[in-house]
């Protein structure tokens, strides 16, 4: 008669290696009497002998995956017992390998000259797959504006119209290599105003000739603004040359007045515009224009239509070189970010930036711009809006938007005058005000925001002021 | 410990002032936004003021715009609440209350302290 | 403002029994562009403070017991303790956020049958 023996494992279990969708065995091999009972456990969890996975075989000594998974991936042992002695263990690791697989591929992408492209590029694999990207027939090169980033996605700053062509990504590793299919990158270019109508200081009835090109695909346009309506008087010329536009106007001046050059190309269903501003003083107001930072003027843009007043002069800051272009610019690329903050801050950070960017203007001989009031901007940061302000500060930017988007500045709070030390020397947000005959929810400013879905703020109810509290920053 | 202590509250005659004060302790007081809440005896919770973090930013009910004015100290970590011509209908328990950053919805409260206006 | 209107009032129920509280307010709280819904549940104990039990209608603050659950959208909205402990008896009030002023429910009183 046998003496029982307890279990002693005599092959220990080893790394095993395998494919996705391939079998992967380990062998645990027992030398015990009485025959043991042997059972396996994945990280330290017991598998099932019924779970249809696996097989399990030669008394328990052969565990098989049957088609391996990428979620297999770990730590495998066997457990001999049969009561004789202890339970004895032997542990081995399986490392799932797989060829380079894009999860994500690119797509197609119409990009605006001067922005940023980013073309997807996403895998899998084990050892993780390298990521390069070719362009037309050969290996793109990274350089300061292109770059594959590190997941696998290429991102092209300010984009330019060489940048367009046919794309694709290559992923690889010691497996094998995976290619995406060719995608097309579009540069749109919009219209650009390529030379700017200069400034004039005249005598009175002088004849001046404003000058004013531009180009863009397709070629734009030109229309002039006198003051912010349509020229009344004066002759334009034009003429077409490679894509570029040249327009010109004649003036005969009787009085001073700021000139606007228009360009305007289509893209599909949307309308690209530039524009270029030139005064035209008479020459006795000439000291007086020079000390302005900017001008006076209608607003004309759509964007901020809703929220600021109607018929409102604002100021246009010249330090721009196109200023109402440029602020329009500016918060039109801010305004696709509001859609993603809360109900509550949306309406107010719109009031706020839309008050900010083109502040409200007094002509006079020197047109000022009147800031916003602190007590609504620190509503706004600190009420509305903590939430994203708060996050926009952690990123050590002065925006209210996402690192990596246009950001948009905002004001400084702290640095903005006090309605209560001197009401005339700051301009109120009545969307953040008390008033009683005040409408009850934000008007819609674009078709995408319908009113329905505007709720109520301080302004808009007969509950709320914004109050003299003296204690601020 | 996260908390919230509120002192001040009596009894007073109609017409009467009371000032209220809220002690925070536990968190940054200075970045958040603080409301009082009030509930009269055996009646629903009434929101009743706020002030932004700074102290710079302040909005009221309109049951006591004029005569309820709300402020801080943030070098003491205190909360106030400086109530004058008060009526009858004051009478409540008064709560401080902070304000979850960037929401209205209220996640740390006060115990109350209970004002009553009667003659 | 939005009023906030809470059935029912007061109601009884048995010790590991289910307790369901509606709130219905006269506008939606659902604000589409990040689909949340602006309500909040609060628990008021006999002679204490309001306690914050649930915000954006289902997420359950720290430390408040798995058995409090909110679901609803848009206007109509419930609180729910699916089994009934005697430290359950309170006050419940829903309140919205939505827009300002935030207001309140009457409240519903929970009692032990």
């Known amino acids: 008669e046998k003496l029982p023996k307890a279990p002693v494992i005599t092959t220990p279990l080893e790394t095993v290696d395998a494919l996705v969708e391939e079998v992967a065995t380990f062998m645990c091999a027992v030398e015990s009497y009485p025959q043991p009972e042997i059972s396996w456990t994945r990280n330290k969890i017991l598998i099932k002998l019924f779970d249809t996975r696996y097989s399990i075989r030669e008394n328990g000594q052969l565990l098989t995956i049957l088609s391996v998974e990428d979620s297999d991936d770990g730590i495998y042992c066997c457990i001999a017992n049969n009561g004789v002695g202890g339970a004895v263990e032997s542990c081995g690791a399986l490392q799932v390998k797989m060829k380079p697989k894009i999860t994500r591929p690119p797509i197609n992408v119409k990009i605006i000259e001067g922005l940023k492209a980013v073309l997807p590029c996403t895998t899998m694999g084990n050892p993780k797959p390298s990521v390069s990207w070719i362009k037309g027939d050969n290996a793109l090169r990274e350089n300061s504006r292109i770059a594959v980033l590190e997941s696998g996605s290429l991102r092209i700053h300010n984009v330019q119209k060489e940048d367009a062509g046919q794309y694709r990504c290559v992923a690889k590793n010691s497996l094998g290599t995976a290619y995406s299919k060719l995608v097309k990158l579009e540069v749109e270019v919009f219209a650009r105003i390529l030379r700017a109508p200069e400034s004039h200081n005249v005598t009175f009835g002088s004849f001046v000739t404003l000058r004013c090109t531009a180009i863009g695909i397709p070629v734009p346009t030109i229309s002039w603004i006198e003051n912010g309506n349509a020229v009344s008087s004066g002759s334009i010329q034009e003429s077409v040359k490679d894509r570029v536009i040249d327009s010109r106007l004649q003036l005969f001046i009787t009085k001073p007045g700021l000139y606007t050059c228009i360009a305007t190309n289509k893209h599909g269903e949307k309308f690209s515009t530039a524009k270029a501003a030139a005064t035209v003083s008479i020459a006795e107001w000439s000291k007086s224009q020079k000390d302005s930072q900017g001008y006076c003027a209608q607003y004309r843009g759509e964007v901020c239509d809703a929220v600021l007043a109607k018929d409102a002069l604002v100021f246009f800051n010249t330090s721009y070189r196109d200023p109402e272009d440029a602020q329009e610019l500016l918060i039109h690329t801010a305004w696709n970010e509001l859609k993603a903050v809360s109900p509550l801050c949306r309406p107010a950070a719109e009031a706020l930036l839309c008050n900010h960017l083109f502040q409200e203007c007094s002509p006079g001989v020197v047109p000022t711009p009147m800031p916003i009031c602190r007590e609504y901007c620190l509503a706004v940061k600190e009420l509305f809006c903590a939430k994203e302000w708060q996050a926009m500060e952690g990123k050590a930017h002065r925006g209210l938007y996402r690192s990596g988007m246009h950001l948009l500045p905002v004001p400084e709070c702290s640095k903005l005058p006090s309605m209560h030390r001197d009401p005339t020397a700051c301009t109120r947000l009545p969307y953040l005000d008390y008033k009683k005959e005040n409408i009850t929810t934000f008007p819609s400013i674009t078709s995408s925001r319908p009113s329905a879905d505007i709720p109520n703020l301080p302004a808009s109810t007969s509950s709320f002021a914004v109050s003299p509290a003296y204690s601020m920053t | 410990e996260v908390q919230l202590l509120e002192s001040g509250g009596g009894l007073v005659q109609p017409g009467g002032s009371l000032r209220l004060s809220c002690a925070a302790s536990?968190?940054?007081?200075?970045?958040?936004?603080m409301s009082w809440v009030r509930q009269a005896p055996g009646k629903g919770l009434e929101w009743v003021s706020v002030?932004?973090?700074?102290?710079?930013?302040?909005y009221y009910a309109d049951s006591v715009k004029g005569h309820f004015t709300i402020s801080r100290d943030n070098s003491k970590n205190t909360l106030y609440l400086q109530m004058n011509s008060l009526r009858a209908e004051d009478t409540a328990v008064y709560y401080c209350?902070?304000?979850?950053?960037?929401?209205?919805?209220?996640?740390?409260w006060g115990r109350g302290t209970l004002v009553t206006v009667s003659s | 403002d939005i009023v906030m209107t809470q059935s029912p009032d007061s109601l009884a129920v048995s010790l590991g029994e289910r307790a369901t509280i509606n709130c219905k307010s006269s506008?939606?709280?659902?604000?589409?562009?990040?689909?949340?819904?602006?309500l909040a549940w609060y628990q008021q104990r006999p002679g204490q403070p309001p306690k914050l039990l649930i915000y954006?209608?289902?997420t359950r603050e720290s430390g408040v017991p798995d058995r409090f659950s909110g679901s609803g959208s848009g206007t109509d909205f419930t609180l729910t303790i699916s089994s009934l402990q005697a430290e359950d008896v309170a006050i419940y009030y829903c309140?919205?956020?939505?827009?300002?002023?935030?207001?309140f429910g009457q409240g519903t009183k929970v009692e032990i049958k």
């Open positions: 209350a902070k304000k979850e950053l960037g929401d209205w919805y209220f996640d740390l």
């Open positions: 536990g968190f940054t007081f200075n970045s958040s936004a």
């Open positions: 002030i932004s973090g700074s102290g710079g930013s302040t």
């Open positions: 506008q939606s709280v659902l604000y589409s562009s990040n689909n949340k819904n602006y």
């Open positions: 954006w209608a289902s």
């Open positions: 309140q919205q956020y939505y827009s300002i002023p935030p207001t």
